[in-house]
């Protein structure tokens, strides 16, 4: 039977995908055939074949990034070390071990689901220079996160969520395979409007919230968080 496991890794980090027999197992590297493939597309990640050092079959995306330990394999540990994790690595990986002395029977089958995450940048909230008399437009930008984020606008006065119909979110997949998000909020002008933009990374269980406060004066731009990193009292990073 195939064992199922899950593991989480940050983009750019290294991760171990576990595939091992019970402790005390011993394997002859001249007997075992070991394969790591992606479960869906059957992309070849790495493999071990007796008396064959060539890895010609390894997919270019995984070449020189995926390794098994020969010493570990002799102990029955066929775990995969994957270096410099990318968003494209968010896959199900299948480890398959066959014994030629057992007539090429499978002796181990493990599927490891890799979940990939990256922290979004602290959101930047801005408003236009010349807002209309009756409506304010806020823009919230956050970049280089993974997976796809949820964006919420919050009325900071009572911490209630604003109606999502008021916001228009655009999510881009950037050249690094990470997500950038821009959320535009159009809201009726009210006195001392105190709102926040919240970027939620569900996988990391992380919320990044930036507050923005406006008074009655149209020109009161100093209350708007242009650079939330330097305006520490306006930036809240919430972990739940």
């Amino acid at each position: 039977d195939t064992q199922e496991k899950e593991v989480r890794a940050m983009v750019g980090s290294d991760v171990e995908l576990s595939c091992a027999c019970p402790e005390g197992s011993r394997f002859d590297l001249n007997d075992v055939y070991v394969y790591w493939q992606t479960s869906e597309s059957k992309t070849v990640v790495t493999y071990h074949i007796p008396q064959n050092s060539s890895l010609d079959n390894v997919d270019s995306h995984y070449r020189n990034r995926a390794l098994m330990s020969p010493a570990g394999m002799q102990r029955g540990d066929f775990s995969l070390r994957l270096f410099n994790v990318t968003p494209q690595d968010e896959q199900k990986f299948h480890c398959l071990v066959l014994s030629q002395s057992l007539g090429f029977q499978e002796v181990l089958s493990v599927v490891v689901t890799l979940h990939v995450a990256a922290n979004f940048s602290v959101p930047v909230v801005s408003i236009p220079h010349n807002p209309s008399q009756d409506e304010l437009t806020f823009t919230c930008t956050s970049i280089n996160g993974y997976p796809r984020p949820n964006v919420y606008w919050i009325n900071k006065t009572d911490n209630s969520l604003l109606d999502q119909a008021l916001q228009n979110d655009t999510v881009f997949l950037n050249t690094r395979g990470l997500y950038d998000v821009v959320s535009v909020l159009r809201i009726a002008r009210t006195p001392s409007l105190n709102i926040g933009c919240c970027i939620e990374n569900v996988l990391l269980r992380q919320n990044l919230t930036v507050g923005s406060q406006t008074g009655n004066s149209i020109g009161e731009r100093d209350k708007i968080t242009e650079n939330p990193v330097s305006t520490r009292e306006k930036t809240e990073v919430t972990w739940s």
Epitope: Q37, E40, Y47, Q51
Partner: antibody
Framework: EVQLVESGGGLVQPGGSLRLSCAGS????????MSWVRQAPGKGLEWVAY????????YYVDSVKGRFTISRDNAKKSLYLQMNSLRAEDTAVYYC??????????????WGQGILVTVSS | DIQMTQSPSSLSASVGDRVTITCRAS??????LAWYQQKPEKAPKSLIY???SLQSGVPSRFSGSGSGTDFTLTISSLQPEDFATYYC?????????FGQGTKVEIK
């Protein structure tokens, strides 16, 4: 234990159709290339068709191109060979075979027991 | 496709004889060669894989050698149960192709 069991063979008239099935067990079916190999009476082994793990690559011997279709259902651990416009020269024992995992150079072929297809009027 | 040429196509031998069958590939296949034994009305049985590795349960009188394009199957001392047809098969690339077979008959 690895097992491949063929079914669907029998007697069919020239120009007729037949669908062979092969049920795999004892291995992770979706991880392997699979094939059909045939052997006409008193003749040698001839590969008929190959199919990659995800079904996206298929190869056919010239003599069956356009008439035979290889397919697989990984969820059912099953391999199929749809044979149309059958000819007398298609009469043979058809073997279902488990092949390798890589594109080249890894596992030897594992054979089913075979099933007879007879094309005759 | 890689062509496999097997010789001889048939041979007559006696019990206890040493028998050699050769197989030549039309291009280099490293050591990705298998040998099968087939008896009438039976599926092929794996004898040798990776040119020289003996399949588990196969008697040690069977041996294989060769690399690249030229390969040999040797039966060191022919036994009554060894009278059968033998096939080579390359599994360096798809489609995996077969030699035409060598029938080993009783002299």
């Amino acid at each position: 234990e690895v097992q491949l069991v063929e079914s669907g063979g029998g007697l069919v008239q020239p120009g007729g159709s037949l669908r062979l099935s092969c049920a795999g067990s004892g291995f992770t079916f979706s991880s392997y290339w699979m094939s059909w190999v045939r052997q006409a009476p008193g003749k040698g082994l001839e590969w008929v068709a190959y199919i990659k793990q995800d079904g996206n690559e298929k190869y056919y011997v010239d003599s069956v191109k356009g008439r035979f279709t290889i397919s697989r259902d990984n969820a059912k651990k099953s391999l199929y060979l749809q044979m149309n416009s059958l000819r007398a020269e298609d009469t043979a024992v058809y073997y279902c075979a488990r092949e390798g995992i890589l594109w080249f150079g890894d596992l030897p072929t594992f054979w089913g027991q075979g099933i007879l297809v007879t094309v005759s009027s | 496709d890689i062509q496999m040429t097997q010789s001889p196509s048939s041979l007559s031998a006696s019990v206890g004889d040493r028998v050699t069958i050769t197989c030549r590939a039309s291009q280099g296949i490293s050591n990705w060669l298998a040998w099968y034994q087939q008896k009438p009305e039976k599926a092929p049985k794996s004898l040798i894989y990776a040119a020289s590795s003996l399949q588990s349960g196969v008697p040690s009188r069977f041996s294989g050698s060769g690399s690249g394009t030229d390969f040999t199957l040797t039966i060191s001392s022919l036994q009554p149960e060894d009278f059968a047809t033998y096939y080579c098969q390359q599994y360096d690339s798809y489609p995996r192709t077969f030699g035409q077979g060598t029938k080993v008959e009783i002299k």
